[in-house]
C-alpha cells in the first residue's frame, strides 16, 4: 500500500490509543438504561412478584433510581466529554469509524438482548451527528463472536 496510507494507519492507531472513549460508553449505556427504565422492554412476571401491583408486566417503574440520577447532569457531562474525544477524529472518517467500532467492541458483551444491541448500534451511529461532526459513510459495527465473556 501507499506510504501515506501506512502513515495514516499509524496516525489513527496513535489517536485511538490516546483517546479516552469511556465517556462515550457511559453516555450510550446510560441512554439505553434510561429507556429500559422508562419503557420497560423487560417482562417481569406478576405471578412471581408478590410486591408488584396489578399492572402491565411489560411496564417498568420509571421512578426507579438510576446510578446517574444522583450525579446531577451526568449524562450531558458524559456526552460533552465524549464529543470532545470524537472531535479528534473529525478529519479522518476511517479513524472515526474505528473509534466507533472500538466502543461497540468494548460494550458488546454488556448487551445480551437483540433490542439492547440494536439500540446501542443506532445510538452509536448517531453519536458523531449528535456531536455536530460528520458521521462515517460506511462503518460496520458488527462484532465477531467472542470465545469467552469479556469484561
Amino acid at each position: 500500500r501507499q506510504q501515506w496510507e501506512l502513515q495514516g494507519d499509524r496516525r489513527c492507531q496513535s489517536q485511538l490509543e490516546r483517546a479516552n472513549l469511556r465517556p462515550c460508553e457511559q453516555h450510550l449505556m446510560q441512554k439505553i438504561q434510561r429507556d429500559e427504565d422508562s419503557y420497560g422492554r423487560d417482562p417481569y412476571s406478576p405471578s412471581q412478584d408478590p410486591y408488584s401491583p396489578s399492572q402491565d408486566p411489560d411496564r417498568r417503574d420509571p421512578y426507579s433510581p438510576s446510578p446517574y440520577d444522583r450525579r446531577g447532569a451526568g449524562s450531558s457531562q458524559h456526552q460533552e466529554r465524549c464529543c470532545n474525544e470524537l472531535n479528534e477524529f473529525e478529519n479522518n472518517q476511517r479513524c472515526m469509524c474505528e473509534a466507533l467500532q472500538q466502543i461497540m467492541e468494548n460494550q458488546s458483551d454488556r448487551l445480551q438482548g437483540r433490542q439492547q444491541e440494536q439500540q446501542f448500534k443506532r445510538e452509536l451511529r448517531n453519536l458523531p451527528q449528535q456531536c455536530g461532526l460528520r458521521a462515517p459513510q460506511r462503518c460496520d459495527l458488527e462484532v465477531e463472536s467472542g470465545g469467552r465473556d469479556r469484561y
Partner: antibody
Framework: VQLVESGGGVVQPGGSLRLSCAAS????????MHWVRQAPGKGLEWVAF????????YYVDSVKGRFTVSRDNSKSTLYLQMNSLRAEDTAVYYC???????????WGRGTLVTVSS | DIVMTQSPLSLPVTPGEPASISCRSS???????????LDWYLQKPGQSPQLLIY???NRASGVPDRFSGSGSGTDFTLNITRVEAEDVGVYYC????????FGQGTKVDIK
Amino acid sequence: VQLVESGGGVVQPGGSLRLSCAASGFTFRDYGMHWVRQAPGKGLEWVAFIRYDERNKYYVDSVKGRFTVSRDNSKSTLYLQMNSLRAEDTAVYYCVKDSGLRYFNLWGRGTLVTVSS
Amino acid sequence: DIVMTQSPLSLPVTPGEPASISCRSSQSLLHSNGYNYLDWYLQKPGQSPQLLIYFGSNRASGVPDRFSGSGSGTDFTLNITRVEAEDVGVYYCMQALQSWTFGQGTKVDIK
C-alpha cells in the same frame, strides 16, 4: 409471562438427561437465557448462558465439556443437555431470562434433577 | 473467577426494624461504562428467586421502596428500612461483570 422447565428426574451417575424450558409471554428470540441450579439446602449457582442469536455460549467450569446449552427460537424453547452426570449435579435447575443487560428478571419454577445410583 | 462473599449468613430481624446485608467481591464490579454489575435477589421459602436490585442501586419493577442498594467497586449493601414479615427468605448478591457468580446467601427470618 412465564418459563416452564421440564425433563428433570432420577438418573444414574454417568447418565444423561435433557432439560427443556418453554417460554411464553415475551419475545423469546430477543433475549439471552440462562440455566441456574440450586443443590438441596444450598445456594444458587449459575450454570450456563446462551445469547439470543446463539453467538456466544458460556458455562461454569464444573460443567464444561459435559453440559450443552441450546435453543430453538421457532419453538421458544431453551435446552440443557447434561451428559456424564455426577452426584454433585443433583439440584433444582432453573430456567432464567436475561434482561438484555445481564441481570436476571424472570425465573421459572425449576425442575429437580437427582443423580443417584 | 470473581468470588462473592456475603455477611452475615444469618440475620434474625424484628418487624419494623431496619436490616442490612453486606456483599463483597474479590475484584471491582465497576465497568468502564460506569455501571456496577451487582444485583440482589430474594428467594422466599418454597419459591423461585426474584430480582430486587440491579446495577447496584436500581430497584426492580414492583419492589417496595423500603429496599435499597448502595455501594461501588467491591463493597455493596442491601438495606431494608423497615422489615416486614413478607421479607423473610434468602437474599443473594450476584456479580454480572465477568460471567455470573452468586454470593452464599443470607437467611433473613423473624426473631
